[in-house]
C-alpha cells in the first residue's frame, strides 16, 4: 500500500486566545500531507486546511458559529502526491483531537487599559473591551458582549512611591477608585471568569501610571 | 476532591516569627487567588491577605503589611503566611482559603497560633 | 475601607422559623458579598453569592438578595443543623471585609 510510510497525527493540541483558535499537532511532514476535520457532537464534519504540510489549523471560522458547543476534530494523513490512497483498512488513518468548548476553554487574553481619568479624590480606569471574532448580526462582538457579568475584571492600583498594593472588581470594563489626592497611583488589570475551573485568568495587563499619557486630570 | 490544609500554627513568644503553610490538593492555586483568614478566639472572621499564586501579587489589609507576608510556591502548590513580631493579639485560628474571584468556595480546617510568653 | 454592618448579632428562633439576616455595606459594593455559616470549631462554609446563586450542596431554604448597600439572607424554614454563626463577607475591594456575625440560637 502507499501508505507504509504515513504517520498518524499525534499530540493534538488546541491552542485558543479570545476565540482565535488554531488545531496544532505533530509530527512535521515527510512525505504526507495533513486535511482537518471538525465538527460539533451532533453535526457532520467540515473539512478545513486540506492537503496541507502545515502542522496547525485555523479553525476560527468554524467554532465562532457557536461558541458554546463542543468540538471535536482529526486531523487525516495522506501521502504526499497520493491523496487518494488509504490505509489498511479502506480509509486514511487519523487521528481525533480532545474536545473542545471555547466558551468554557479560550484563553483570556492580556486585557489592555484604554484610560484613566481623575476627579478629585476619584479615578476611573477604563478597560480595553477587546473585540473578538465571535459575529452576531455581521457585527463583531467584543469579549464582554460574549462573557456577559461571567467575565470580571480585577485591579491592581498602587501609589508609585509605595509597595503596598490594593485591589477591586468589576463585572463591567469600568473602575471607580478612591485615591488620595496629590499622589500618582499605577495600574494592572486581571481578567477573570470565576466559574470556570481551567483557563479561568489572563496574564496581567501591562501596568500604567498616571502622570502618563493614557491618563487625564480633572479637579 | 479539593482540600486545603493548613499547618505551623503552635506557641510563639511575642515578638516571635511563625511560617504557616496551606498546602491545596484537587486543583492547582496558580488558577485561583489564595486567602488568609484569621479568627481570634470567640472573636468574627479577619481578612488578612491574598496571593495570586499565579503571578506573586499580594494584597494586605493595611494593618499586617508591615508584619505579615503571603507568598506561594506552584510547584509545591502550597500558599504561606510568615508572621514577624507577633503580639499577643495575634492569637487566632487562620485559616486559608480559595477564592474564584466571585467567592471563597474552599477553606482549610485552621490552624492555631498561641501567642504568649 | 468599607465597613460591613450586620444585624442582628444574635437571635434565637425556633425549628420551621424564618430567619432574616441583613448586612449593610458603608458604600455601594454592586453585587460583590456572600454569605457563609461557621459552627463551632469548624471553618466558615460558603452558602451564597451574588448575583444570588447557591453554593453546591446548599439547601434551598437559604436564599439572598439585595445589592449596592443592603443584603439579606434568609432562611425560609430553620432546620436544627441550621444553629450556627452567620458571616457576610465583601470582596469588592480591598482590604475585604466581614460583618460581625450573627448568631443563630435555639429558642
Known amino acids: 500500500s502507499g501508505t507504509t510510510n504515513t504517520v498518524a497525527a499525534y499530540n493534538l493540541t488546541w491552542k485558543s486566545t479570545n476565540f482565535k483558535t488554531i488545531l496544532e499537532w505533530e509530527p512535521k511532514p515527510v512525505n504526507q500531507v495533513y486535511t482537518v476535520q471538525i465538527s460539533t457532537k451532533s453535526g457532520d464534519w467540515k473539512s478545513k486546511c486540506f492537503y496541507t504540510t502545515d502542522t496547525e489549523c485555523d479553525l476560527t471560522d468554524e467554532i465562532v458559529k457557536d461558541v458554546k458547543q463542543t468540538y471535536l476534530a482529526r486531523v487525516f494523513s495522506y501521502p504526499a502526491g497520493n491523496v487518494e490512497s488509504t490505509g489498511s483498512a479502506g480509509e486514511p488513518l487519523y487521528e481525533n483531537s480532545p474536545e473542545f468548548t471555547p466558551y468554557l476553554e479560550t484563553n483570556l487574553g492580556q486585557p489592555t487599559i484604554q484610560s484613566f481619568e481623575q476627579v478629585g479624590t476619584k479615578v476611573n480606569v477604563t478597560v480595553e473591551d477587546e473585540r473578538t471574532l465571535v459575529r452576531r448580526n455581521n457585527t463583531f462582538l467584543s469579549l464582554r458582549d460574549v462573557f456577559g457579568k461571567d467575565l470580571i475584571y480585577t485591579l491592581y492600583y498602587w501609589k508609585s512611591s509605595s509597595s503596598g498594593k490594593k485591589t477591586a472588581k468589576t463585572n463591567t470594563n469600568e473602575f471607580l477608585i478612591d485615591v488620595d489626592k496629590g499622589e500618582n497611583y499605577c495600574f494592572s488589570v486581571q481578567a477573570v471568569i470565576p466559574s470556570r475551573t481551567v483557563n479561568r485568568k489572563s496574564t496581567d495587563s501591562p501596568v500604567e501610571c498616571m502622570g502618563q499619557e493614557k491618563g487625564e486630570f480633572r479637579e | 476532591e479539593v482540600q486545603l490544609v493548613e499547618s505551623g500554627g503552635g506557641l510563639v513568644q511575642p515578638g516571635g516569627s511563625l511560617r504557616l503553610s496551606c498546602a491545596a490538593s484537587?486543583?492547582?492555586?496558580?488558577?485561583?487567588?489564595m486567602h488568609w483568614v484569621r479568627q481570634a478566639p470567640g472573636k468574627g472572621l479577619e481578612w488578612v491577605g491574598w496571593?495570586?499564586?499565579?503571578?506573586?501579587?499580594?494584597i494586605y489589609d493595611p494593618k499586617f503589611q508591615d508584619r505579615f507576608t503571603i507568598s506561594a510556591d506552584t510547584s509545591k502548590n502550597t500558599a504561606y503566611l510568615q508572621m514577624n513580631s507577633l503580639r499577643a493579639e495575634d492569637t487566632a485560628v487562620y485559616y486559608c482559603a480559595r477564592d474564584t474571584a466571585a467567592y471563597f468556595d474552599y477553606w482549610g480546617q485552621g490552624t492555631l497560633v498561641t501567642v504568649s510568653s | 475601607d468599607i465597613q460591613m454592618t450586620q444585624s442582628p448579632s444574635s437571635l434565637s428562633a425556633s425549628v420551621g422559623d424564618r430567619v432574616t439576616i441583613t448586612c449593610k455595606a458603608s458604600r455601594d459594593i454592586k453585587s460583590y458579598l456572600s454569605w457563609y455559616q461557621q459552627k463551632p470549631g469548624k471553618a466558615p462554609k460558603l452558602l451564597i453569592y451574588?448575583?444570588?446563586g447557591l453554593a453546591d450542596g446548599v439547601p434551598s431554604r437559604f436564599s439572598g438578595s439585595g445589592s449596592g448597600t443592603d443584603f439579606t439572607l434568609t432562611i425560609s424554614s430553620l432546620q436544627p443543623e441550621d444553629f450556627a454563626t452567620y458571616y457576610c463577607l465583601q470582596h469588592g475591594e480591598s482590604p475585604f471585609t466581614f460583618g460581625q456575625g450573627t448568631k443563630v440560637e435555639i429558642k
Open positions: 484537587g486543583f492547582n492555586i496558580k488558577d485561583y487567588y
Open positions: 451574588y448575583e444570588p
Open positions: 496571593i495570586d499564586p499565579e503571578n506573586g501579587n499580594t
